[in-house]
Structure formats: structure tokens, C-alpha cells
């Protein structure tokens, strides 16, 4: 199943995807689409690159802010809304028949909550639940495999709503995580 990345409404979401150009500088076309990667190309294309640059964007909110020329084709979606939630496909279109690399990533957009969890709860949340928090301008540089989590310092305010905080607190207590 896809790795999940979480962003708050109004924040920027970061969906990682990368490849290693071989040889360096030998870029290949990439498309990002809304929906799981289909057999061919991308469905509902939101952004497309050619061998040189981004040549198709369906909205000014979609950006490649990483080092595109080194194969970092991670997608940044600015000012996300609940409608941006869902699975996205990053397709690295390597020449040849059926050579494409396909990566499905899931974006979960949440409403800003009215409460701020304690710092330790923030950290424990990230260690107890293998989902990426992607509220900053940039996120982890590499695609994570399901179940893994980069050891990054996450500062997320207004994370979940009160009910979710309560539920997660109980789950963390059951899992042995520290709660203060």
C-alpha cells in the first residue's frame, strides 16, 4: 500500500519522488497525476516534465522545488485543501517498453485543530504512527518505504482535532509511548 503523507489545510504538502539520472544530467520525462498509477502515462495529470523542464502544470499550486536536474522530482502542493486528499502517482518515464518507475503516494489533508499537543506527544505521535508529516516547505528527501519514518525533527502544531488527540493518546498509552 502507499505511504501516507499528512498536511494541514492551508499548508504546503510535500510528496517525495526521485530517481538517479544515468548518466548524470540525462533527464527523463516525469508525470504526476491524481489517482493511482495506471498502466500507461498518468491519469489526471497535475504536472509533467520533459527532458529539460516542467512543461505542463494544471495549477500554479503544483511545483517541483527540489533539484530537478539531479532527479529530485518531489511534488509540492501549495495551500492544500481537503479536495487535494487522495493517491498521487509519480511516474518516471524511462525509455523502453514497460520500463517506467511508478510510485503511488497518499496525501491526507487534515483540518487545523484547535488544540496544540505537547511537544513530547508530537514526537511520540510520529514514532508510533508510520505516516509522514508534511506541513513544512520541504520534507524528507527520499521516498520512504511503507512502515519506515525518517528521523527528522517535526514541529507540527494543531495536529489532530481534540477527539483524535484523545484517541491517539490512548493508543500511545497502550503502545507504551511516553505521554505528558
Amino acid at each position: 500500500s502507499e505511504v501516507e503523507y499528512i498536511a494541514e489545510v492551508g499548508q504546503n504538502a510535500y510528496l517525495p519522488c526521485s530517481y538517479t539520472p544515468a548518466p548524470p544530467g540525462n533527464l527523463v520525462p516525469v508525470c504526476w497525476g491524481k489517482g493511482a498509477c495506471p498502466v500507461f502515462d498518468c491519469s489526471n495529470v497535475v504536472l509533467r516534465t520533459d527532458n529539460r523542464d516542467v512543461n505542463d502544470r494544471t495549477s500554479g499550486r503544483y511545483w517541483l522545488k527540489g533539484d530537478f536536474h539531479k532527479g529530485d522530482v518531489s511534488l509540492t502542493i501549495e495551500n492544500v485543501t481537503l479536495a487535494d486528499s487522495g493517491v498521487y502517482c509519480c511516474r518516471i518515464q524511462i525509455p523502453g517498453i514497460m520500463n517506467d518507475e511508478k510510485h503511488n503516494v497518499k496525501l491526507v489533508v487534515i483540518k487545523p485543530a484547535k488544540v496544540t499537543p505537547a511537544p513530547t506527544l508530537q514526537r511520540d505521535l510520529t514514532s508510533a504512527f508510520p505516516r509522514m508529516l508534511t506541513t513544512g516547505e520541504h520534507g524528507p528527501a527520499e521516498t520512504q518505504t511503507p512502515g519506515s519514518l525518517p528521523d527528522v525533527n517535526l514541529t507540527v502544531s494543531n495536529f489532530f482535532c481534540e477527539l483524535q488527540i484523545f484517541t491517539l493518546t490512548n493508543e500511545l498509552r497502550d503502545s507504551g509511548a511516553t505521554i505528558r
Partner: antibody, heavy 116, light 107 residues
Framework: EVQLVESGGDLVQPGGSLRLSCAAS????????MTWVRQAPGRGLEWVAN????????YYVDSVKGRFTLSRDDAKNSLYLQMNSLRAEDTAVYYC?????????WGQGTLVTVSS | ETVMTQSPATLSVSPGERATLSCRAN??????LAWYQQKPGQAPRLLIY???TRATGFPARFSGSGSGTEFTLTISSLQSEDFAVYYC?????????FGGGTKVEIK
Amino acid sequence: EVQLVESGGDLVQPGGSLRLSCAASGFTFSTYWMTWVRQAPGRGLEWVANIKQDGSAKYYVDSVKGRFTLSRDDAKNSLYLQMNSLRAEDTAVYYCARGSNWFDYWGQGTLVTVSS
Amino acid sequence: ETVMTQSPATLSVSPGERATLSCRANQNVYSNLAWYQQKPGQAPRLLIYDASTRATGFPARFSGSGSGTEFTLTISSLQSEDFAVYYCQQYNNWPLTFGGGTKVEIK
């Protein structure tokens, strides 16, 4: 108005060849994947082959690989399917369709009958 | 290959009634599923794509739902022009495959 018009269907003997054509109009042909889908008489639909916008990649269902060749001529807004070593099981109406994964416009079809 | 199974093969419905058509995949196809309508002597017409997005030209009485392996096409109130054969098609796995079709006929 988008239009796709197939031609070239005929009665042919097993082992024979045919070339189907699809003339496209009403859209920018060169920016779309194009596809052939077939339907045997009284039967369901079967995807046959498709071709990328620039012609750099062509894909075929296993049952026609090595026998059918897909090509396009963007200057003529046309799609072609060269069918060799035809078999009785290739008998079908062949539809030209626009798209790669799902197909939003279809032609009226051309009937290919393979029989001795 | 991904096998798409449609049921029932034939559905007899009276005009004005609701019709529910099922399509099942033998492996996950996410929401990469389309529905087509085909009338006798005509080419298929795209009806639904991405499991639930209605194509241009079809009214709101047609709706698609489901993801993964189970999908449904619902026609809320059948009109005379809706009697046809309906095919589902997955585009998640190689090769692209269609279901065998469901014929919706007048009861």
C-alpha cells in the same frame, strides 16, 4: 467535433494481411495516445494495442505480438494497424479509440473477417 | 492478467426502476476503472472513468462507486435510452482488460 473513422476492414484468408486506417479530426491528434480495441461478433471488448503521442512506445496484447504493427502519421492525423499472419480468432470489429488507459472517443469500427 | 467479472450477465428492469451493475477484479485496481455503454450496432461510449467520474454527455442518474476490487454502476431511474450493454474496464494492471458485459434489458 471529435471524429474517428476507421477503414480497411475486409474478408481475408487465414495467414493473410490487412492494413487498417483511422482518420482523426476535431482534436490535436499529435498530443494524444491512440488505441485499437476489437470486438468479436457477439462478444465482449478486447484491448489490442496502443501508441504514445510521439510514437516512441507501442504496446500490444500478447495474442497479436509479432503479427500486428501499430504506427501513426501525425502530419496526416492518421493511425494505422498492419495485421499479418491473420487467424480466424482475429475476426472482429476493430475500433480506433482516443486515449491510453480509458477511451473517451471511438470510431464506428471496421469489420475484419478471417475465413477460408 | 487481471480478470474482470461482471454480474449479472443480464439484468431485466422496468423503466423508472433502479439498476445496479457489479464489476469485480481478481486483484487490486485501485480506482483505475472505467465503464462504457454500448448500444446495438454502435461503438462503445465512455460513461465513467476513475471509478466514479462521469464522462461528458451522461446525466446524473448514472453513478459509479467502489475501489480496489469491487465496483458498482448505478442507474437511479432507468430511461428507455439506457437499455444497452455495459462494460467495465480496468487500467491499473497490464494488460488492459474488460469485463464480459452486463446487458440491461426491458422487463
